[in-house]
């Protein structure tokens, strides 16, 4: 239930996060599961624990194994497992499947390739990017923050992309590389000003107090893969994440491609345990892309339960 796979290359830095959640103030203890030996916290060690993070600086093939992390809350010890595998560096250019992160796909209008796991590291821009082991050069390639943007993507751009960056720990530098495949979807598409299919403008949605309710924001943006298209919900003009109501969450639906070929997106707003005060809020379905933003407003009203008379 709380286990996670992590991998890296020998002589590179590898940082692994404990799969169990805990507050930053909680103590986290790490152990090497096979020997039950405690991982030290002193940074002078090559392998050391730092709160929720386990750091291999640098990693060695012998470090492979299962590591146990125990998050010590005041009430319970919450246990997680990190299955770590460190591989020898390949002499040739090929990156084996077991070192690959998830494949991403792009098109002419959307060609972002994110560098996997980089958020765990203390790195500074710019990233170096390689395709099939060749350093990327030319104005078509732009390293931006933690991702690579390719302009005017062509089918020939498909391949394995490796990001390389330096992790800094107390003044010492360690190299990190991560590779993922990029596939190109060959689509002749176009984009339009967003069209919201649901909800209707100023729609009144009936809900029952105490029950769960779902609102779906659905919009279409044109044909083919869209660059910079999004649907989202706002509450009283505020982003859901900023509104601070744990009962109300948004959840991405499926990318939809209707029979007419239009590219559409869904965003479902889930309201758990509907309360009276939810009826006072204004719910805005927003659809935006490079052409602009369209907004449809929904309000909730109380559904009166049907009386059953004998």
């Amino acid at each position: 239930k709380f286990s996670k796979q992590s991998w890296g290359l020998e002589n590179e830095a590898l940082i692994v996060r404990c799969p169990r959640q805990g507050k930053p103030s909680y103590t986290v203890d790490w152990y090497y599961s096979q020997t039950n030996k405690s991982i030290p916290t002193q940074e002078r060690n090559r392998v050391f624990a730092s709160g929720q993070l386990l750091k291999f600086l640098p990693a060695a093939v012998a470090d492979s194994g299962i590591y146990t992390c125990i998050v010590r809350s005041p009430t319970f010890n919450r246990t997680g497992y990190a299955n770590v595998t460190i591989y020898k560096k390949q002499s040739d250019c090929n990156v084996p499947d077991y070192l690959m992160y998830s494949t991403v796909s792009g098109s002419e209008k959307n060609s972002k390739i994110y560098c996997p796991t980089i958020d765990l590291y203390n790195w500074t821009a710019p990233l170096e990017w390689f395709k099939n082991c060749q350093a990327l050069q030319g104005s078509r390639y732009r390293a931006h923050k933690s991702f690579l943007v390719i302009d005017n993507v062509m089918t020939e751009d498909a391949g394995d992309y490796t990001c390389k960056f330096i992790h800094n720990e107390n003044g010492a530098n360690y190299s990190v590389t991560a590779t993922r495949s990029f596939t190109v979807k060959d689509e002749q598409g176009f984009s339009l000003f967003p069209v919201i299919g649901a909800p209707a403008q100023n729609e009144i949605k009936e809900v029952e107090i105490g029950k769960n309710a779902n609102l779906t924001c659905s919009a279409c943006f044109g044909k083919g893969t869209q660059f910079l298209a999004a649907v989202l919900w706002q509450l009283n003009g505020t982003k859901i994440t900023d509104f601070g109501e744990p009962r109300i969450q948004q959840e991405e639906g499926q990318n939809q491609s209707f029979s007419n070929g239009l590219a559409c997106l869904d965003m479902v707003l889930r309201i758990a345990d509907v309360k009276e005060e939810d009826l006072l809020l204004q719910y805005d379905c927003l659809a935006l892309n490079l052409h602009g933003l369209r907004r449809h407003t929904v309000r909730l009203s109380r559904k009166n339960p049907i009386d059953h008379h004998s």
């Epitope: 507050k23 930053p24 103030s25 809350s73 005041p74 009430t75 319970f76 010890n77 744990p246 345990d273």
Partner: antibody, heavy 119, light 106 residues
């Protein structure tokens, strides 16, 4: 929606034992810790202890060790607290409470069980 | 055990007034939670992790603090705010509550 249904009021004799129950619904019982709290006019709110229904692990306030025993039945999504060797100072309102697993605070409280210990 | 001392024990305020109640811990805690209880009802989560409002809590409430000193503030008191407010720490076992501040409206 999340509900914690506690058993009804109890009137018991000193020296006896009693088991209070708390039936959970509206969420996955094993995903959240269940805690118990005692409330009296004199001492206010006191944390008794907690159980992790997934593992059966328990944590107690030292003050209530030997007094309270916490258990959970996964099949019925019910948490139990047994109170033993009852005395008048055990007379109180008792709450079972679910804990928010992200922020570690008491997010859903049962409606309470009133326990009266009297001869 | 970490002892939480709430002050004042009773707070009397007029509607529209700004009020602040405090909770002092006998040793440093990382976060403070607050609960509201009205007579005959179970306590309700009110503020968690020092400053986050729980579900359905009006925006006139706010929480702040760090270390050993925490507070709950109501910018403009309303009649429905009359209740007892308890602070609670989750930094060490046993978890402990304050004795409460009872907010009365004039």
């Amino acid at each position: 929606q999340v509900q914690l249904q506690q058993s009804g009021a109890e009137l018991v004799r000193p020296g006896a034992s009693v088991t209070l129950s708390c039936k959970a619904s509206g969420y996955t019982f094993t995903d959240y810790e269940m805690h118990w709290v005692k409330q009296t006019p004199v001492l206010g709110l006191e944390w008794i202890g907690a159980i992790d229904p997934e593992t059966g692990d328990t944590a107690y306030n030292q003050k209530f060790k030997g007094k309270a025993t916490l258990t959970a039945d996964k099949s019925s999504s019910t948490a139990y607290m047994e109170l033993s060797s009852l005395a008048s100072e055990d007379s109180a309102v008792y709450y079972c409470i679910r804990v928010d697993s992200n922020y570690d605070y008491f997010d859903y409280w049962g409606q309470d069980t009133t326990l009266t210990v009297s001869s | 055990d970490i002892v939480l001392t709430q002050s004042p024990p009773i707070l009397s305020a007029s509607p529209g007034e700004k009020v602040t109640m405090t909770c002092r811990a006998s040793s440093s805690v990382s976060y403070m939670h607050w609960y509201q209880q009205k007579p005959g009802s179970s306590p309700k989560p009110w503020i968690y992790d020092t400053s986050n409002l729980a579900s359905g809590v009006p925006a006139r409430f706010s929480g702040s603090g760090s270390g050993t000193s925490y507070s709950l503030t109501i910018s403009r008191v309303e009649a429905e705010d009359a209740a007892t407010y308890y602070c609670q720490q989750w930094s060490s076992n046993p978890l402990t509550f304050g004795a409460g501040t009872k907010l009365e409206l004039k």
